[in-house]
Interface confidence: low
Amino acid sequence: EEELQVIQPDKSVLVAAGETATLRCTATSLIPVGPIQWFRGAGPGRELIYNQKEGHFPRVTTVSDLTKRNNMDFSIRIGNITPADAGTYYCVKFRKGSPDDVEFKSGAGTELSVRAKPSAPVVSGPAARATPQHTVSFTCESHGFSPRDITLKWFKNGNELSDFQTNVDPVGESVSYSIHSTAKVVLTREDVHSQVICEVAHVTLQGDPLRGTANLSETIRVPPTLEVTQQPVRAENQVNVTCQVRKFYPQRLQLTWLENGNVSRTETASTVTENKDGTYNWMSWLLVNVSAHRDDVKLTCQVEHDGQPAVSKSHDLKVSAHPKEQGSNTAAENTGSNERNIY
C-alpha cells in the first residue's frame, strides 16, 4: 500500500494583521495511526503551535473534527494574527510509539506572511519658516507595515514631486517595516495656501492610499513690500503720510514711524486685508504737522515682520513747499495707485 504523505497545498498564505490564517494540511492515509502536530520553524528550536493529542492552544481551532476516525484533514485556523506570527509552519504526522510518539512524516511547509497596514503618514516641515525661492525639506514617516513592498509619493498641490529620498527599514527580513522619506520643496510667493502631501500605497490598503499633509502656511514667510506716499489734507499745516505694507505672511507684524530717526508711533498689524493668495495687506498713516518743523522732515516707515530684522522705507517731506503742491506732486508720482486716501 502507498505510504502516507502529508500534503500542505499552500506554499504561502498571506493574511492581514488581526485576521485569521488558515493553514491547510491533509494526509493521504489513515495509517499509521498517530496524532498530528503543527510547528513553526524546523529543527530542534521549532515552536509547537498545535498538538492534536494534548495541550491548550486558545488561538488555534481545527477546520475539521479530528475526533472522527476517518478524518485526514488536519488544517488549522490561527486567530488574531500579528506580524510576530510570520514564519514557516509545518504539519507533522506522528506514529504511535512506546513510550513516546515518533515523528513519521512532515509536510513541505506553508510560509505565513502577515500583511499589516502602515500607520498614517506623519509629515513634518522645517522648524523655522523660510522665504520664497528657498528650498525646504519635509519628512514623512509611516510604520508597522508588512510586507516590505511599499510605494511613497510626494505631491504639492496635486503635482507630483520628484526631488525626494526614501528609505525602508530594516533592510533585512523583519516582521514589520518603517518608511522614511525626505522631500525638497522650493517655496514660491503663492504658497501660503499650498499643501504638501505624502501618499503611501501598500497591498493592505486595497488601492486606497494613506495620506499625510503639511500646510505650507506653517512653513512659509512672505516678507512685505513697503510703499510710503504723501497725501494733502485740508488743513494747510498738515500732511498725511501713508505706509502701504503689502503681500506679507504670516500676519505677525509691527510698524514703527520715525520722524528724522526718532520714534513717533509704533503699532501692531490688526485689521489687515487678505489677498487671494493668502498674503495680507495693511496700511498705516501718520499725520504730520508741518508747522512744527523748521527743516525738511525724513519720515521712515519701519516694519518688523515675524521677528525678522526690520525693513524700512523713507519719504522726505519738504516743509518749505506748500503741502497741497507736495500732495499733488506725490499723487502724480503714484499714478495708478488704487489705495484709498485717508484723511
Epitope: D10, K11, L14, V15, P147, V203, Q206
Partner: antibody, heavy 130, light 103 residues
Framework: VTLDESGGGLQTPGGALSLVCKAS????????MGWVRQAPGKGLEFVAG??????????TYGAAVNGRATISRDNGQSTVRLQLNNLRAEDTGIYFC??????????????????????WGHGTEVIVSS | AVTQPASVSANLGETVKITCSGD???YGWYQQKAPGSAPVTLI????KRPSNIPSRFSGSKSGSTATLTITGVQADDEAVYYC??????????FGAGTTLTVL
C-alpha cells in the same frame, strides 16, 4: 472587469501557439489567472493557471497539456500568456481566459482557479489542422 | 474526479438542485448557454455569488458534495451547468456538465 483574448486562429499540427489575455478593471497582480478551453461538443477543461501571492508566482497545468504548455504573466502590462507547443488536433477549441476571485485581499491568497473563477473572457478560437 | 448528473429537468417556477461530488474544499458553478460562448460564474468558493447574479442562484457544500440551487426556475435558465474544483496538485477539474431543461 474585462478580459480580452487574442492569438487564436488556424494552427498547424506540431506547431506552437501563443495566446494573450489582456486584463483591465481590477488590480491584476493581486489575482490568480488561468486558461480554460472547450473542444467542439465537449465540456470545459482546465488548461493552465498562474498564481500571485506575496510576490511569488506559481503555475499549474492540466494533464492534457502538461509538458507542452507554459503560462506566464506580465503584471506591468496586465497580461497573461499561454504558450502551447507540439500542437495536436485535440487542442482545437475555444480558449477562455479566466480570473479567479482569490487574491491578496483580507483573506488568504488561495492558490485556486477552477473553483473560484469570477470573470471570463469571450474566448478565442484555435483550430489545429493540416 | 468531479461527478455531476448529465441532465436535470424542472417545471417553470420550481426549485432545482444540481449536485457535484468530489474531494475538494471549494467548488465553483458556471453556466454556459451555448457551446463556445463565454461561461458565466454563478457561484465561486462554494457559496459566494457575484454581485451581478440573481439571488435565485445559491451554492452550498455539505461533506464532499456541493449543490447549486436555483429557486423559481425560469425559461432563460436552460443551459449547461459546470462545477469546478481543484485537486491536491492545484490542477483544476471541471465536471462533465449538467444540462438543465425547463419544462
Amino acid at each position: 472587469v474585462t478580459l480580452d483574448e487574442s492569438g487564436g486562429g488556424l494552427q498547424t499540427p506540431g506547431g506552437a501557439l501563443s495566446l494573450v489575455c489582456k486584463a483591465s478593471g481590477f488590480t491584476f497582480n493581486s489575482y490568480n489567472m488561468g486558461w480554460v478551453r472547450q473542444a467542439p461538443g465537449k465540456g470545459l477543461e482546465f488548461v493552465a493557471g498562474i498564481y500571485s501571492a506575496g510576490g511569488d508566482t506559481s503555475t499549474t497545468y492540466g494533464a492534457a497539456v502538461n509538458g507542452r504548455a507554459t503560462i506566464s504573466r506580465d503584471n506591468g502590462q496586465s497580461t497573461v500568456r499561454l504558450q502551447l507547443n507540439n500542437l495536436r488536433a485535440e487542442d482545437t477549441g475555444i480558449y477562455f481566459c479566466a480570473k479567479a476571485a482569490g487574491g491578496c485581499t483580507a483573506h488568504n491568497c488561495d492558490a485556486y482557479i477552477a473553483d473560484s473563477i469570477d470573470a471570463w473572457g469571450h474566448g478565442t478560437e484555435v483550430i489545429v489542422s493540416s | 474526479a468531479v461527478t455531476q448528473p448529465a441532465s436535470v429537468s424542472a417545471n417553470l417556477g420550481e426549485t432545482v438542485k444540481i449536485t457535484c461530488s468530489g474531494d475538494s474544499s471549494y467548488y465553483g458553478w458556471y453556466q454556459q448557454k451555448a457551446p463556445g460562448s463565454a461561461p458565466v460564474t454563478l457561484i465561486y468558493d462554494n457559496d459566494k455569488r457575484p454581485s451581478n447574479i440573481p439571488s435565485r442562484f445559491s451554492g452550498s457544500k455539505s461533506g464532499s458534495t456541493a449543490t447549486l440551487t436555483i429557486t423559481g426556475v425560469q425559461a432563460d435558465d436552460e443551459a449547461v451547468y459546470y462545477c469546478g474544483n481543484e485537486d491536491m496538485n492545484y490542477v483544476g477539474i471541471f465536471g462533465a456538465g449538467t444540462t438543465l431543461t425547463v419544462l
